[in-house]
């Protein structure tokens, strides 16, 4: 009825779109909640994190696990009181990810 | 005064973290701005975006030119009329990008 | 320390051209974007645009779009600013401005520009 | 463009008073970010400007406590606590929000 090809190449389409943990890219201070005084160079770092579509609009694509790992950067605070530090952070990199339904929120929260 | 070995790693970090196109994952329908009763098989597809970060913190990672590409997908209307019907869909690739700030909105608009 | 040496006083001919420089030491210098800022009469601040050292994009107020051309050489860690068609409302005090992840931080000293026939 | 319209242009102040300027622009500074990237400089006699607030709040490296700053949405502004003879010189607030960047016309911080 469809031609066979089409149907490989939707189906690896699909495939690829699947949630999964893709490489993205995280701003370091938002994700530790640093102050404004503190920043880092580069401001940004790349790791894995949960992504990608689920086949029911009722799912959400959340990590199952989770390694942590570190990055090494210059942690810079204003007012400088010295030279920019390089420090190791440590940031959650997603190893496994699934289509979960979002838990219902607490009628009294 | 700092390893040569970990500026380097430190800098190659900080190139993978910046703004270009990255391969995302879009939901065809809510792309296409298309009515609740229309969906498709598979829900979403892989294309390019921009993504990524800037070295200011009021920039903006952003598309400077686009692509269309096709993607061969089911369309599915609700109630079933007919059978799934595979069609060409035309989704934005985003193949260049540029941290750029923000213009201020004109006070009339 | 961050430091942004800039190139001497500048007196020229109106019509000609004149390229500044701005050396920068201190800090990485591909790591941030270079602004520069027109100040006249000891008073008013103008923001001319910025080129990014890494790729060297550039981003000009539409004001000065047809006066300044902004250059970097990364070998030098050194950002140029060349101005065109010099008229006497040229004269002026032009910064170069290191931008930090939150604001433009650090300010060369400044050179002074003077349109005179 | 954003207008930035800095109050008063000439603030007279005796040494340990407290002087307070005021910058009101034409616009929302905030960003889409939810930032708002209002900065405040001071350029002493003679020399270049020197970056002293950052993002309404936020002293910069070596500024002294006495400097504060607050603010939100179009109105800003710029508190000196204790005024002291190394404070004197022209002030300007800058927004870094929306391009192009732009300045208040500066405020002459002088003995009275």
């Known amino acids: 009825f469809y031609d066979i090809e089409t149907l490989k190449v939707i189906d690896e389409e699909w495939q690829r779109t699947q949630c999964s943990p893709r490489e993205t890219c995280v701003e370091v201070a938002s994700e530790l909640g640093k102050s404004t005084n503190t920043f880092f160079k580069p401001p940004c770092v790349n790791v894995f994190r949960c992504g990608g579509c689920c086949n029911e609009e009722s799912l959400i694509c959340m990590n199952t696990s989770t390694s942590y790992i570190s990055k090494q950067l210059f942690e810079i605070s204003v007012p400088l009181t010295s030279v920019p530090e390089l420090v190791p952070v440590k940031v959650a990199n997603h190893t496994g990810c699934k289509c979960l339904p979002t838990a219902p929120r607490h009628p009294y929260s | 005064f700092y390893d040569i070995e970990t500026l380097k790693v430190i800098d190659e970090e900080w190139q993978r973290t910046q703004c270009s196109p990255r391969e995302t994952c879009v939901e065809v329908a809510s792309e296409l701005g298309k009515s609740t009763n229309t969906f498709f098989k598979p829900p979403c597809v892989n294309v390019f975006r921009c993504g990524g970060c800037c070295n200011e913190e009021s920039l903006i990672c952003m598309n400077t030119s686009t692509s269309y590409i096709s993607k061969q997908l089911f369309e599915i209307s609700v109630p079933l009329t007919s059978v799934p019907e595979l069609v060409p869909v035309k989704v934005a690739n985003h193949t260049g990008c540029k941290c750029l700030p923000t213009a201020p909105r004109h006070p009339y608009s | 320390e961050v430091q942004l040496q800039q190139s001497g006083p500048e007196l020229v001919k109106p019509g000609a051209s004149v390229k500044m420089s701005c050396k920068a030491s201190?800090?990485?210098?591909?790591?941030?974007?270079m602004h520069w800022v027109k100040q006249s009469h000891g008073r008013s601040l103008e923001w001319i645009g910025y080129?990014?050292?890494?790729?060297?994009?550039?981003y000009y107020n539409q004001k000065f779009r047809d006066k300044a051309t902004l250059t970097v050489d990364k070998s030098s860690s050194t950002a140029y600013m060349q101005l065109n068609s010099l008229t006497s409302e040229d004269s002026a005090l032009y910064y170069c401005?290191?931008?930090?992840?939150?604001?433009?931080?650090?300010w060369g000293q400044g050179t002074s520009v003077t349109v005179s026939s | 463009d954003i207008v930035m319209t800095q109050t008063p242009l000439s603030l007279p102040v005796s040494l340990g008073d407290q002087a307070s300027i005021s910058c009101r622009s034409s616009q929302s500074l905030v960003h889409i970010n939810g930032n708002t990237y209002l900065h405040w400089y001071l350029q002493k006699p003679g020399q270049s400007p020197k970056l002293l607030i950052y993002k309404v709040s936020n002293r910069f490296s070596g500024v002294p406590d006495r400097f504060s700053g607050s603010g939100s949405g179009t109105d800003f502004t710029l508190k000196i606590s204790r005024v002291e003879a190394e404070d004197l010189g022209v002030y300007f607030c800058s927004q870094g929000t929306h391009v192009p960047r732009t300045f208040g016309g500066g405020t002459k911080l002088e003995i009275n």
């Open positions: 201190g800090y990485s210098f591909t790591g941030y974007n």
């Open positions: 080129i990014d050292p890494y790729n060297g994009d550039t």
């Open positions: 401005i290191r931008a930090g992840y939150y604001a433009m931080d650090y």
